[in-house]
Interface confidence: low
Amino acid sequence: TLNSVLNSNAIKNLPPPLGGAAGHPGSAVSAAPGILYPGGNKYQTIDNYQPYPCAEDEECGTDEYCASPTRGGDAGVQICLACRKRRKRCMRHAMCCPGNYCKNGICVSSDQNHFRGEIEETITESFGNDHSTLDGYSRRTTLSSKMYHTKGQEGSVCLRSSDCASGLCCARHFWSKICKPVLKEGQVCTKHRRKGSHGLEIFQRCYCGEGLSCRIQKDHHQASNSSRLHTCQRH
């Protein structure tokens, strides 16, 4: 339930197959509308979110891919965007969430035994980023249409980070988003983990605080890719 993550950004509830995935969710990630990729028709700036610049997909988290944030945007300016879940439009495998791949422009399950059936007809829709919202709505929130006048405290339901009090960000918890503490120096963060795990639980960490970036912990450089530990470190 929500209460299990109200007091921490740590990934506490994940079963073993997910725990090793740096806390990133699997095939059912919902990308809230926001920053758009080619194929979309609107643009929304990010509220209180520092986009992570990238040059290739491998620099992004397991539930992200690297792309230009605007429709037909400058290819030289790319950031990590939320991955596309099953049934969403894609242009390459990396755009699809863990456990999925891009086939005929649609993200489909890479495990053919999950469900048996044909791929649905291609539909035109926006490519989104989970860190912002479009037209004031989010794909996975329980916030009522009436916005709060006071900034949300830790555990409060939110739509975007600007809804949360200082020092908090709006992060996913399954089908909701709640205010969680922005990560401090030395805290474990999520970065650079590539795809491959399954699962539906979504327990998202906040981003690192001001002046910090999510990098491999120095004494973990020799570790295998699957066990690299990332922490918030000074620039």
Epitope: T1, L18, R86, R87, H114, R116, L134, D135, W175, L200
Partner: antibody, heavy 118, light 107 residues
Framework: EVQLLESGGGLVQPGGSLRLSCAAS????????MSWVRQAPGKGLEWVSA????????YYADSVKGRFTISRDNSKNTLYLQMNSLRAEDTAVYYC???????????WGQGTLVTVSS | DIQMTQSPSSLSASVGDRVTITCRAS??????LNWYQQKPGKAPKLLIY???GLQSGVPSRFSGSGSGTDFTLTISSLQPEDFATYYC?????????FGQGTKVEIK
């Protein structure tokens, strides 16, 4: 072929309990969230509860919160709904449902009727 | 919770007719709108997902459109097997909510 088969429905008195089961086959059960949706006689559809693939997170409609408990046994490919303190307004056909996408209910069971009456 | 309102509640039509059912959300839900068909004594069947995506195996005479708060399900040429009750459902916000249904009857 995906199949969902509910059982456990029946007649129960107000305040009583029932446990519904949903046997799943045709897909990798523990990879997907599952839901219970109900439909009162002659009425529309109402989402009741959902559970994540591992069973680690559960969700309930306000109307059943504190009375119903959703659970799953992934080793048996079975979903459950424990219903306590039943009320007349809980009378409905209960469907278990799941989906290849997390946005829809692609697959439904045939439903099991729960009647709460004295 | 997001309220979903369908109209009309029921309608009478003949085979071959073009039928339109509308669904309105109490707040913006983007394209997270699905349509289901239900026949008496049967479980609902998914027709349209994400407002306009045709579910595999569903005849092309069914189509969906709309975004934001207003959505439409259209049956271009009503067939005998299409007489049923149709429900819209939003999956933008938890909990998912359904419309009250539209019953399509034979005129």
């Amino acid at each position: 072929e995906v199949q969902l088969l509910e059982s456990g429905g029946g007649l129960v008195q107000p305040g009583g309990s029932l446990r519904l089961s949903c046997a799943a086959s045709g897909f990798t059960f523990d990879q997907y969230d599952m839901s219970w949706v109900r439909q009162a006689p002659g009425k529309g559809l109402e989402w009741v509860s959902a559970i994540t693939g591992s069973g680690g997170s559960t969700y309930y409609a306000d109307s059943v919160k504190g009375r119903f408990t959703i659970s799953r046994d992934n080793s048996k490919n079975t979903l459950y709904l424990q219903m306590n303190s039943l009320r007349a307004e809980d009378t409905a056909v209960y469907y278990c449902a799941t989906a290849e996408s997390d946005d829809t209910y692609d697959y439904w069971g045939q439903g099991t009727l729960v009647t709460v009456s004295s | 919770d997001i309220q979903m309102t369908q109209s009309p509640s029921s309608l009478s039509a003949s085979v071959g007719d073009r039928v339109t059912i509308t669904c309105r959300a109490s707040q913006t839900i983007g394209d997270y709108l699905n349509w289901y068909q239900q026949k008496p004594g049967k479980a609902p069947k998914l027709l349209i997902y994400a407002a306009s995506g045709l579910q595999s195996g569903v005849p092309s005479r069914f189509s969906g459109s709309g975004s934001g708060t207003d959505f439409t399900l259209t049956i271009s040429s009503l067939q005998p097997e299409d007489f049923a009750t149709y429900y819209c459902q939003q999956s933008n916000s938890w909990p998912y909510t359904f419309g009250q249904g539209t019953k399509v009857e034979i005129k």
